[in-house]
Amino acid sequence: IPPHVQKSVNNDMIVTDNNGAVKFPQLCKFCDVRFSTCDNQKSCMSNCSITSICEKPQEVCVAVWRKNDENITLETVCHDPKLPYHDFILEDAASPKCIMKEKKKPGETFFMCSCSSDECNDNIIFSEEYNTSNPD
């Protein structure tokens, strides 16, 4: 960071390495919770038209797919992987692709994925063979 750009103490809006290089924030689909028609498919597009700049450079893209007796929803957000989301740790935050993993939630089917390439939560992947065989 050049000297004229102040670095505030304990500020999480800027991430730098030892050489002063600055980390750019992630670009993620960010439509919060929307009704979805994504069901029984190997992968789905988010159908979210909003690509937002994540507020903090350490945040990653997240997608949450939920199905209950009444509806299906897809949530797309930015989130800090150091913090749980919906009470779950974002284990796959460094992945370039958003590969859905099922989580135990009573009364619904709940899948979540996280990833760290631009707009990676636009394409959510459920396919088991992708999970196990794709080196990406």
């Epitope: 960071i1 050049p2 000297p3 390495d17 050489n19 002063g20 290089a21 600055v22 980390k23 750019f24 670009l27 700049i53 390439s117 631009d118």
Partner: nanobody, 124 residues
């Protein structure tokens, strides 16, 4: 030598508008995603808006979406930020920065990626 020179800041009343410019030189402008970044007094950097080198795809922070518009003129090597419906919380020094698309970090040069900034003050 890479240079980014911001201009267009000033004092404006709440609800008013300003247009910032960033004149770029010393690098191939059309190879870089360009950003507007701001720093309010005593606060950290906030990443406001970005635009792709070609195709003019744009991105905004949620705090400014719908009020700010980023654009670029590749023939003039210039980046713009049109700011409407300004609020007191938009008061900050505004910088432009360049990014190779897909690269997560700036280069290690502390001076390569930042101009001196232009001050925007929103006050009645």
């Amino acid at each position: 030598e890479v240079q980014l020179l911001e201009s267009g800041g000033g004092l404006v009343q709440p609800g008013g508008s300003l247009r910032l410019s960033c004149a770029a030189s010393g690098f191939t402008f059309t190879e870089y995603r360009m950003w507007w970044v701001r720093q309010a007094p005593g606060k950290g950097l906030e990443w406001v808006s970005a635009i792709e080198p070609i195709g003019n795809r744009t991105y905004y922070a949620r705090s400014v979406a719908g009020r700010f518009t980023i654009s670029r003129d590749n023939s003039k090597n210039t980046l713009y930020l049109q700011m409407n419906s300004l609020r007191a919380e938009d008061t900050a020094v505004y910088y432009c920065a360049k990014q190779i698309p897909g690269r997560k970090w700036t280069a290690n040069s502390r001076f390569d990626y930042w101009g001196q900034g232009t001050l925007v003050t929103v006050s009645s």
